[in-house]
């Protein structure tokens, strides 16, 4: 059973992930972003279901494409280089979902834009955080 300290750690990690995703979304939606039109052509895949931490596998599998999209943006839109930002997110996601169990992600048929994709995972983080608190 999860202890209060492990729950607190999970909550902090989710909050960190949430902030990272929100920062990316804000950077992309920046009105000075000249690459937004092209960024929106990139297809992202959404999970059929995202209600548990193991479903973060679906986010993890989209972090490569996410890094490529962020490479298009001007670096001043973000505090970190895309490679470092994605690397940080990968560490958090791996700790949250664990590396031991190999969960195979199921994707929805409809693809999404980067904005829809980020909003979906922001909502996921907020939802899990609310259950922990």
């Amino acid at each position: 059973a999860p202890t209060s300290s492990s729950t607190k750690k999970t909550q902090l990690q989710l909050e960190h992930l949430l902030l990272d995703l929100q920062m990316i979304l804000n950077g992309i939606n920046n009105y000075k972003n000249p690459k937004l039109t092209r960024m929106l052509t990139f297809k992202f895949y959404m999970p059929k279901k995202a209600t548990e931490l193991k479903h973060l596998q679906c986010l993890e599998e989209e972090l490569g494409p996410l890094e490529e999209v962020l490479n298009l943006a001007q670096s001043k839109n973000f505090h970190l280089r895309p490679r470092d930002l994605i690397s940080n997110i990968r560490v958090i996601v791996l700790e949250l979902k664990g590396s031991e169990t190999t969960f195979m992600c199921e994707y929805a048929d409809e693809t999404a834009t980067i904005v829809e994709f980020l909003n979906r995972w922001i909502t996921f983080c907020q939802s899990i955080i609310s259950t922990l608190t």
Partner: antibody, heavy 123, light 107 residues
Framework: QVQLVQSGAEVKKPGATVKISCKVS????????MHWVRQAPGQGLEWIGR????????KYAENFKGRVTITADTSTDTAYMELSSLRSEDTAVYYC????????????????WGQGTLVTVSS | DIVLTQSPATLSLSPGERATLSCQAS??????LSWYQQKPGQAPRLLIY???SLASGIPARFSGSRSGTDFTLTISSLEPEDFAVYYC?????????FGQGTKLEIK
């Protein structure tokens, strides 16, 4: 169906420079990241680098930095790989291949390949 | 750089038999792994992407699986045209790296 057609075989002397082309047909080159991979005779595959033809941004493997230049001409839907200061160890078949994030998940991998260009470096 | 170690280097089997090829990553790469088949004088051909997904046009006898950093390509019943060299590739981080290959030969 996307097709990649590469330029013909080359024979070069040590120290020389080679430039190989890869023409994309069936789609526009700007839909793809163009990657280059090589294979020495009887050996495995080695990633060289890639270009985003839309904005000419490149990434190179450390082993090739300073010797390789990947470019693209969007007007002709052609990518190029130039390798300088050639040595005998550069004798290999050079392939262009694609990655895209605009279509299916499958095409995020090296789905389309050129037929390969044999470069022989010999004195 | 991420190192992919394939085993065995050579696998000798007969048509109709089951082939199991292994690829081990030196660090965690999630499902960012694909498998390619290469025949002499030809370019590699994508078989499996994202560790377990079958590429279009590839027969269902090919399948991929993953356990941690260990990846497996299985050919359930070998056909004569399956005898070739197989490579794994990681797309987790640049530089992208390939395994050294497994040669599948007719016994």
């Amino acid at each position: 169906q996307v097709q990649l057609v590469q330029s013909g075989a080359e024979v070069k002397k040590p120290g020389a420079t080679v430039k190989i082309s890869c023409k994309v047909s069936g789609d526009t080159i700007t839909a793809y990241y163009m990657h280059w991979v090589r294979q020495a005779p009887g050996q495995g595959l080695e990633w060289i680098g890639r270009i985003d033809p839309e904005d000419d941004s490149t990434k190179y493997a450390e082993n090739f930095k300073g010797r390789v230049t990947i470019t693209a001409d969007t007007s002709t839907d052609t990518a190029y790989m130039e390798l300088s200061s050639l040595r005998s160890e550069d004798t290999a078949v050079y392939y262009c291949t694609t990655v895209t994030f605009l279509y299916s998940r499958e095409l995020r991998w090296f789905a389309y390949w050129g037929q390969g260009t044999l470069v022989t470096v010999s004195s | 750089d991420i190192v992919l170690t394939q085993s065995p280097a050579t696998l000798s089997l007969s048509p109709g038999e089951r082939a199991t090829l292994s690829c081990q990553a030196s660090q965690y790469i999630s499902n960012y792994l694909s498998w390619y088949q290469q025949k002499p004088g030809q370019a590699p051909r994508l078989l499996i992407y994202s560790a377990t997904s079958l590429a279009s046009g590839i027969p269902a006898r090919f399948s991929g699986s993953r356990s941690g950093t260990d990846f497996t390509l299985t050919i359930s019943s070998l056909e004569p045209e399956d005898f070739a060299v197989y490579y794994c590739l990681q797309h987790y981080s640049t530089p992208y790296t390939f395994g050294q290959g497994t040669k599948l030969e007719i016994k």
